[in-house]
Amino acid sequence: DAEFRHDSGYEVHHQKLVFFAEDVGSNKGAIIGLMVGGVVIA
C-alpha cells in the first residue's frame, strides 16, 4: 500500500489576493483572500 506523508515533497504555495468590493457589489474597500494551490479559500 502507498503511504502518504505530509512532508512527501509536495509544496503548497499560498498567495494573498486583494479585490475591490465595489467590483462585485456596492460596498467600498478591499476584500482580502488567500489562494492555496490555485484555489481561493478565504
Partner: nanobody, 124 residues
Framework: EVQLVESGGGLVQAGGSLRLSCVAS????????MGWFRQAPGKEREFVAA????????YYTDSVKGRFTISRDSSKNTVYLQMNSLKPEDTADYYC?????????????????WGQGTQVTVSS
C-alpha cells in the same frame, strides 16, 4: 492602441515629495482599476497602490501606507500617485498599470496594460 504614459519622476532628497501622473488613452477608463507598481534595481516588480474604477476605494502595500496617496481624475483619464516623506528605499522605476474590474489588484499578472515607467531616485 492603448497607451499609459507616466510622468513626474525625478531626483528628490529623503523626506521630500513627488507626484507621479499616468495618462491613459485608447481604453474605457471607467472599466479599469488602476495600479502603481515599482521595480528597484536588481529586484522584482512589486505592487504599490491601486484605486477602483470609481475612485472610491484604494489599497496600499504596507510600506507606503500613510505616505503615498493614489487618486484618479476620470475627466482627464489620469491616475496620480502623491508620494510624501520619501525614503531612499523608495528609489525605483514606477509603473502605472490597468486591470479590468474583478481582477486581483495586487497581482502583476492581472494587469492588462502597462506604461513604460518613470524613474524615482531618493537621495539620503
Amino acid at each position: 492602441e492603448v497607451q499609459l504614459v507616466e510622468s513626474g519622476g525625478g531626483l528628490v532628497q529623503a523626506g521630500g515629495s513627488l507626484r507621479l501622473s499616468c495618462v491613459a488613452s485608447g481604453l474605457t477608463f471607467s472599466s479599469y482599476n488602476m495600479g502603481w507598481f515599482r521595480q528597484a534595481p536588481g529586484k522584482e516588480r512589486e505592487f504599490v497602490a491601486a484605486i477602483s474604477r470609481s475612485g472610491g476605494s484604494t489599497y496600499y502595500t504596507d510600506s507606503v501606507k500613510g505616505r503615498f496617496t493614489i487618486s484618479r481624475d476620470s475627466s482627464k483619464n489620469t491616475v496620480y500617485l502623491q508620494m510624501n516623506s520619501l525614503k531612499p528605499e523608495d528609489t525605483a522605476d514606477y509603473y502605472c498599470a490597468a486591470a479590468l474590474f474583478g481582477s486581483a489588484i495586487n497581482l502583476l499578472s492581472e494587469y492588462r496594460y502597462w506604461g513604460q515607467g518613470t524613474q524615482v531616485t531618493v537621495s539620503s
